[in-house]
């Protein structure tokens, strides 16, 4: 089945805005809103924001989990409001971060 | 929005310890890490160390390890930064901010800890 | 402890572009990412670029950054009177497992 296309007019959500991109705000507007974690060095980054272009989330929101990076997607006004992305597997310690729990 | 509120002024004599603490209101306190940065009078910024409050452990600079501790209390989503044997060295204003490992996006207003004698 | 090194100072007339350096390692900005903050006279540092070269909402794209091997850069154009500030680069050095800072760049506007 085709990816669906998307609308001339396409509709924006409401997104809960936490985290690098978002300056001052705590929200944005966008096509789709995401959730987001990856491990870095044994360092879990959490992000929460929106995709303003169609094209910009389509292939970010279809990746699927890996060990190091999750993204979770959706549409609706503030739906990633109470989504914590969680990785596929338990995480493994990296060499050397001794001093962070991984889950 | 995220904002990050300190603790106010202190004044230590050497050889005492400072704790500093770091309010995070708006978003979500224990997923996100927590850098504790600090800049002595006409000098550039140091880092001393970090927390991941949703795992209760610290990473911390060299420079400050067996003198620094980092804690966080997710009940009252604060996080602290206690400095012990205090010297001259240490007057500085400390910062804490949200730490997303590609930048430090949220910052506090920071915290003048003064040591003398 | 600086790590990283920028010039201590740069200059530039209003509307002049100015670039401001930073160096690091294989262990720093070599295999992360780098970001830069902005500091005024009195006030906490304001996160200006991450991710390398990634504003966040709000910062004007007259400032840009960008990474190569070992070193990074922050550009700024149109330079305005109020740009007069501190400006540091910042990366996660693997070796340390630590945040490391550059000593900071004195930017002037002139005139």
């Known amino acids: 089945m085709e990816d669906e296309k998307p609308k001339v007019n396409p509709k924006l959500y409401m997104c809960v805005c936490e985290g690098l991109s978002c300056g001052n705000e705590d929200h944005c507007e966008g096509q789709q809103c995401f959730s987001s974690l990856s491990i870095n060095d044994g360092f879990h980054v959490y992000q929460k924001g929106c995709f303003q272009v169609y094209e910009q989330g389509k292939m970010t929101c279809k990746t699927p989990p890996s060990p190091g990076q999750a993204v979770e997607c959706c549409q609706g006004d503030w739906c990633n409001r109470n989504i914590t992305a969680q990785l596929p597997t338990k995480g493994k310690s990296f060499p050397g971060t001794q001093n962070f729990h991984l889950e | 929005q995220v904002q990050l509120v300190q603790s106010g002024a202190e004044v230590k004599k050497p050889g005492s310890s400072v704790k500093v603490s770091c309010k995070a209101s708006?978003?979500?306190?224990?997923?996100?890490?927590i850098s504790w940065v600090r800049q002595a009078p006409g000098q550039g910024l140091e880092w001393m160390g970090l927390?991941?409050?949703?795992?209760?452990?610290?990473n911390y600079a060299q420079k400050f390890q067996g003198r620094v501790t980092i804690t966080a209390d997710e009940s009252t989503s604060t996080a602290y930064m206690e400095l012990s044997s205090l010297r001259s060295e240490d007057t500085a204003v400390y910062y804490c901010?949200?730490?997303?490992?590609?930048?430090?996006?949220?910052w506090g207003q920071g915290t003048l800890v003064t040591v003398s004698s | 402890d600086i790590v990283l090194t920028q010039p201590p100072s740069v200059s530039g007339a209003p509307g002049q572009r100015v670039t401001i350096s930073c160096s690091g390692s294989?262990?720093?900005?070599?295999?992360?990412?780098v970001s830069w903050y902005q500091q005024l006279p009195g006030t906490a540092p304001k996160l200006l670029i991450y991710?390398?070269?990634k504003r966040p909402s709000g910062v004007p794209d007259r400032f840009s950054g960008s990474k190569s091997g070992t070193s990074a850069s922050l550009a700024i154009t149109g330079l305005q009177a109020e740009d007069e500030a501190d400006y540091y680069c910042?990366?996660?050095?693997?070796?340390?497992?630590?945040?490391?800072f550059g000593g900071g760049t004195k930017l002037t506007v002139l005139g």
């Open positions: 708006g978003g979500t306190f224990s997923t996100h890490a």
């Open positions: 991710d390398n070269s």
């Open positions: 901010a949200r730490d997303y490992y590609g930048g430090m996006a949220y």
């Open positions: 910042s990366s996660w050095d693997l070796l340390s497992k630590s945040r490391v």
């Open positions: 927390i991941q409050p949703r795992f209760g452990t610290a």
């Open positions: 294989s262990s720093n900005i070599g295999q992360n990412y």
